[in-house]
Interface confidence: medium
């Protein structure tokens, strides 16, 4: 069986004019998935991205995420690329985004 992922892109504000954009894929099967950030259509280098492992979400399907830090104002240049079971798609950073403020630690 194949269950395509639901993909969601969110932003959170960080210091010094940078924001963290996170791309989450959920409710997909099988487990193999490609999830990576692209800038102007080109995949970012591995060391500029952070990934979560691909883990069960409790419904017989899986979830994972990838995040990267970008300059605020350059959101339109970045897309999250997803490939799963022969299907693929790109997901932009939402332009009318609501920033989730991270609490100071």
């Amino acid at each position: 069986r194949t269950v395509p992922p639901m993909v969601n892109v969110t932003c959170s504000e960080v210091s010094e004019g940078n924001i963290t954009v996170t791309c989450r894929a959920s409710s997909f099967y099988p487990r193999n998935i490609t999830l990576t950030w692209r800038q102007d259509g080109v995949s970012l280098s591995h060391n500029t991205q952070q990934w979560g492992d691909v883990l069960p979400d409790g419904n017989g399907t899986y979830q994972t995420w990838v995040a990267t830090r970008i300059r605020q104002g350059e959101e339109q240049r970045f897309t999250c690329y997803m490939e799963h079971s022969g299907n693929h798609g790109t997901h932009p950073v939402p332009s009318g985004k609501v920033l989730v403020l991270q609490s100071q630690r």
């Epitope: 487990r31 193999n32 490609t34 999830l35 591995h46 990934w51 979560g52 492992d53 022969g86």
Partner: antibody, heavy 119, light 108 residues
Framework: QVQLQESGPGLVKPSETLSLTCTVS????????VHWIRQPPGKGLEWIGM???????DYNAAFISRVTISVDTSKNQFSLKLSSVTAADTAVYYC?????????????WGQGTLVTVSS | EIVLTQSPGTLSLSPGERATLSCTAS???????LHWYQQKPGQAPRLLIY???NLASGIPDRFSGSGSGTDFTLTISRLEPEDFAVYYC?????????FGQGTKLEIK
């Protein structure tokens, strides 16, 4: 830095169980999974199986009836057990970290340990 | 299972020359899941190129990869003495995750 170290008996008798451990440092076992791969002397690489961070496993069908891969997070160790061994199981056994992200490649390897199956 | 066939089995070249190594899959492999490893005698393999064309950390840019579908290539633009080793392609597209039989790159 990231390190993986395989250990276990270098000699195993036919029909017995091969048991190896992979002790890791420099990364969290709750964040990265591990593959086990073997290489018979003078031959190529063969994937045995892997364990994900939630403890679930994927095995090569060629080994599935006699292989078990597990993790002990308290000891920072992964383990491989291969039962009912024969001379054909003589090989260098490697553990390798399952890289993250969009490729799942084996980004760091142990140095390998040679296991000889002989009576 | 997906069988990866590497050619040639042995490649004899001199330092400074260009090396082209081929990996052919028995069925289509996503470029995201095709990787190359280098192995020197007595050592463990090390990740060279991941996802067909991305250099792993610390790998010099004389190495490059390309391809799609069933045909993939590893190219070393100008051979250095330390490049003589065995090279394996590897697919993570479908279990069991298989390796090619290897190409031995030796000094001519």
């Amino acid at each position: 830095q990231v390190q993986l170290q395989e250990s276990g008996p270098g000699l195993v008798k036919p029909s017995e169980t091969l048991s190896l451990t992979c002790t890791v440092s420099g990364f969290s076992l709750t964040t990265y999974g591990v593959h086990w791969i073997r290489q018979p002397p003078g031959k190529g690489l063969e994937w045995i199986g892997m364990i994900w961070t939630d403890g679930t496993t994927d095995y090569n069908a060629a080994f599935i009836s006699r292989v078990t891969i597990s993790v002990d997070t308290s000891k920072n160790q992964f383990s491989l057990k291969l039962s009912s061994v024969t001379a054909a199981d003589t090989a260098v056994y490697y553990c390798a970290r399952k890289g993250h992200g969009y490729y799942y490649a084996m980004d760091y390897w142990g140095q390998g340990t040679l296991v000889t199956v002989s009576s | 299972e997906i069988v990866l066939t590497q050619s040639p089995g042995t490649l004899s070249l001199s330092p400074g020359e260009r090396a082209t190594l081929s990996c052919t899959a028995s069925s289509s492999v996503s470029s995201s899941y095709l990787h190359w490893y280098q192995q020197k005698p007595g050592q463990a393999p090390r990740l060279l190129i991941y996802s067909t064309s991305n250099l792993a950390s610390g790998i010099p840019d004389r190495f490059s990869g390309s391809g799609s579908g069933t045909d993939f290539t590893l190219t070393i633009s100008r051979l250095e003495p330390e490049d003589f080793a065995v090279y394996y392609c590897h697919q993570y597209h479908r279990s069991p995750f298989t390796f090619g039989q290897g190409t031995k790159l030796e000094i001519k």
